[in-house]
């Protein structure tokens, strides 16, 4: 949904501009007062002039005060009350409820499955390249390189557990020290937060939903980035994570236990393994410089194999390579020795779609990437639609109160910590922080959960994923037990340290403020969300990676000025907002810089120029798809099908007064003013025609 037009001086009293209105043209905002403002500080408010002859139904839509866009929308129930229904109506209502619940669980199942397939797709597309990142010898000496490798690999394979398991196997085989592995783990923590940010992009159609969803997703990113910003230098200086975890590992005499329980995977695996199955060992082998692995396919062909250990005569380059002098001989030309060779006999092929296609990994990856993103998007839309229809009236009130209400005084502070525990527990159940945070994102978007509550849930999710890793480490074989446990503990203590930094004191909850700021910008300039993703998860890590390869002098030479400029800008920004008088007049705002350096408006114009030609066909496609969807769902004929086309319609709003069109499952008189929606009029023909 489009946000309200931005006004520099919104009138607090709506009667002043509703009474004497004579024109249907919307009042244009007074730009004279905007000089000091940056894009994300403007408060969105709607101001309309209405003709007295218009229906009062329209007036319900008008906000009577300046609303906070972060306030949760009021999801009011317009349906017939239970007591007013007849027996048939009650039965129908019950069946509808059960049907919706089944649909919700079904779409949720496919949503989780598509996340799993998405991860597989990313591994097929970028897994081998990700593996090669690890084989870089500079990781040992350069923690910054380790960090960006952790980010890039996790982004490319869409799974922190994959990158972590590679690190574990590298540490176990002495290719990497625990000290060098810690920054990679930190990077993996950052990389894993891209998944729910991608999920948030799926809600781009509705501005206010997108604002909340994107902020809710990026709160995870900011927490991870800020934690690394503080804790990586601390770790480099003190090695506290390494020391603490080493003490713990050495103080216990661990016996490797049973495998970590697969909880959610038990349900999703039967389906996902019909789509594709991967041989994850290939990426690890590439990381460990195994040349033969580079030509292996990641797509698993044989699922049932028989491994037989036999003693085999093999040739070796020299006597030095012999297992023992007495087990060495010559045939006159070559030196031979006897080695235990594991011979793998293929018994049964896997049962997935791609088993007989023999397509290259990249092709399979791209196919799965497209399919999984479409399924992910479709499921997300349907989940949001179903939740929107379910979470109304009493249900909404109960759920919102349960989730977002604090404990009574003086225990209010405990609520957040309980949320952390809930997040950790839920993540432990689903065995993936990506799945949990991705499921959380649409709930934040539709306004069931506040960002303030989503934040501790996300932090808990970070803890939950490390407890899973600790369990998995305890189940690992003897040779990797120590290293995998120490790395899992490093991950755990890193997240604990991050929580201690950015949660206990409300003032330090910077990730929330930063995420809200980004949410505001992204709601206004939706393209910026994609830019954010590309810059933070690809460009910055790749630039640091490139500079690190060039050597310390280059990295420092480029990095120091950049860091200096960033610090300077932040200090200036802080002084401008807190005590501008201490600054010279010129520095009290950013106007001394060219507009493109302190505003996104010029960039927006450029991007609009490029994306303009694609908007109309996209809009038509969106409408057709939506109408088909409405038919299938049995929505009212006049349902609103053009949320994604709002931008195009905003231009038309200048010609006519926006009248709220009914939403699916809504009644005409439902008030959703708190959501801050201004709907473009749907003509009669548009409502009935398909």
């Amino acid at each position: 949904m489009a946000p309200w037009p931005e006004l520099g001086d919104a009138q607090p009293n709506p009667s002043k501009y509703l009474e004497g209105a004579t024109s249907q043209q919307p009042i244009t905002p007074d730009k004279s007062k905007e000089t000091n403002k940056t894009d994300n500080t403007e408060v969105p408010v709607t101001k309309f002039e209405l003709l007295p002859t218009y229906s009062t139904a329209t007036l319900i839509e008008e906000p009577t005060e300046v609303d906070d866009p972060w306030n949760l929308p009021t999801l009011q129930d317009s349906g017939i009350k239970w007591s007013e229904r007849d027996a048939k109506g009650k039965i129908l209502c019950v069946f509808q409820g059960i049907g919706r619940l089944i649909l919700l669980l079904g779409f949720l199942y496919f949503f989780v499955c598509s996340l799993d397939v998405l991860s597989s797709a990313f591994q097929l597309v970028g897994g081998k390249m990700a593996g090669q990142f690890f084989s870089n010898s500079s990781i040992m000496s350069n923690p910054l390189l380790g960090l960006v490798i952790g980010v890039l690999v996790t982004v490319f394979v869409q799974s922190s557990s994959t990158s972590t398991s590679i690190v574990v196997s590298m540490v176990a085989s002495s290719l990497l020290t625990v000290r060098a592995a810690i920054p990679i783990i930190m990077g993996a923590n950052i990389g894993t937060s891209i998944t729910n940010t991608i999920v948030a992009l799926m809600q781009v159609g509705d501005r206010s939903e997108f604002r909340r969803a994107f902020a809710g997703a990026t709160v995870h990113d900011f927490f991870n980035w800020l934690s690394v910003l503080v804790l990586l230098p601390v770790e480099v200086a003190t090695h506290y994570l390494e020391v603490v975890t080493q003490l713990i590992v050495e103080s216990f005499h661990f016996k490797n236990g049973e495998d970590a329980p697969d909880l959610l995977k038990v349900i999703t695996k039967p389906f996902t393994k019909l789509i594709v199955q991967l041989d994850k060992k290939v990426i690890s082998q590439i990381a460990m410089n195994d040349e033969t692995a580079k030509n292996k396919s990641l797509v698993k062909i044989w699922c049932k194999t028989f491994t037989n250990m036999t003693q085999m005569n093999v040739t070796v380059p020299s006597m030095a390579n012999c297992t023992s002098p007495s087990l060495c001989w010559t045939d006159g030309i070559q030196i031979w020795t006897m080695k235990n060779v594991t011979y793998k006999e293929n018994i049964a092929k896997c049962q997935h779609i791609f088993v007989n296609f023999h397509l290259p990994d990249l092709a399979v990856g791209i196919i799965l990437l497209i399919i999984s993103l479409l399924v992910l998007c479709g499921c997300l839309i349907m989940i949001v639609k179903i939740l929107g229809s379910v979470l109304k009236g009493q249900v909404a009130t109960v759920i919102k109160k349960t989730i977002n209400t604090d404990f009574p005084f003086p225990f209010a502070w405990l609520t957040g910590y309980l949320a952390i525990l809930v997040g950790a527990g839920m993540t432990f159940i689903v065995q993936s922080s990506s799945v949990f945070t991705s499921a959380l994102t649409p709930l934040i978007g539709i306004g069931v959960i506040t960002i303030e509550r989503a934040y501790p849930l996300t932090l808990g999710s970070n803890i939950g994923t490390t407890t899973t890793a600790i369990l998995a480490a305890l189940a690992s074989p003897g040779n990797t037990l120590r290293s995998s446990l120490q790395i899992a503990l490093c991950h755990f203590f890193f997240n604990i340290s991050g929580i201690l930094l950015w949660y206990p004191i409300p003032f330090t909850r910077l990730p929330i403020r930063m995420a809200k700021g980004l949410g505001n910008i992204s709601a206004k300039y939706r393209w910026f969300a994609i830019f954010y993703l590309i810059i933070f998860f690809f460009l910055i890590p790749l630039t640091v990676f490139g500079l690190s390869l060039a050597g310390w002098p280059v990295l420092v030479g480029v990095g120091v000025p950049v860091v200096f400029i960033i610090i300077l800008v932040l200090c200036l920004r802080l002084l401008q907002s807190r005590c501008p008088r201490v600054l010279p007049k010129k520095l009290q705002n950013w106007n001394f810089l060219p507009l493109c350096m302190h505003s996104l408006k010029p960039w927006d114009a450029v991007i609009s120029k490029f994306t303009g030609p694609f908007q109309m066909p996209c809009c038509c496609c969106c409408r057709v798809c939506c109408r088909v969807c409405c038919l299938l769902c049995g929505c009212p004929k006049c349902c609103r099908c053009s949320k994604c086309c709002q931008d195009l319609e905003e231009g038309q709003e200048a010609q006519g007064v926006p009248v709220k069109a009914p939403e699916t499952f809504d009644n005409i008189t439902i008030s959703r003013e708190a959501q801050g929606e201004v709907r473009a009029p749907d003509s009669k023909t548009e409502c009935t025609a398909l």
Epitope: C328, D331, W336
Partner: antibody, heavy 119, light 107 residues
Amino acid sequence: QVQLVQSGAEVKKPGASVKVSCKTSGYTFTTNNMHWVRQAPGQGLEWIGAIYPGSGATAYNQKFKGRVTMTADTSTSTVYMELSSLRSEDTAVYYCARGMYGHGAMDYWGQGTLVTVSS
Amino acid sequence: DIQLTQSPSFLSASVGDRVTITCKASQDVGTAVAWYQQKPGKSPKLLIYWATTRHSGVPDRFSGSGSGTEFTFTISSLQPEDFATYFCQQYSSNPLTFGQGTKLEIK
């Protein structure tokens, strides 16, 4: 059945060279090494070297290095051993022997070629 | 180079006798030892390889044992056709080397 047929006896003058051939049949020529062993009159066996016909790789006894050359012709399944700078102590029966795959035991031997070096 | 020392150099025995020949290596050769039989004017014939394994077609009265540096070759019951010279050979490392031989004669 496996057969190794060697060329006939040779009489050479000191300083000259001799090239002994060994034609094989009854097995895949390129899979097994071919060894050359000599036996001086009334003496024991002495290994000269070996060739792997599949790649042409050779290994020689240090004692003969620089004087011996072994070659293989896959088209005729024949191996050759050439010994140069002959001395009187090189008078011996020269055998070609097929090496067993993967180790240095010799399972089939040629009939031997007597090379006599005298002035 | 690895030296192989066979003993005895000469051995007289009668048909039906049990005969044992030993072969000592100057260093550990594992089990990379072969035994050959050579009759006058003929080419050597492989009897045993890997110290204990009989070559195809070799009668079971011929056997070998040992590992490391000491090896023994045994004929359990001498037959008239068994009178010949016997050689041990190591193929643990290049150059391949042979023992000086043991001549088995009729008593």
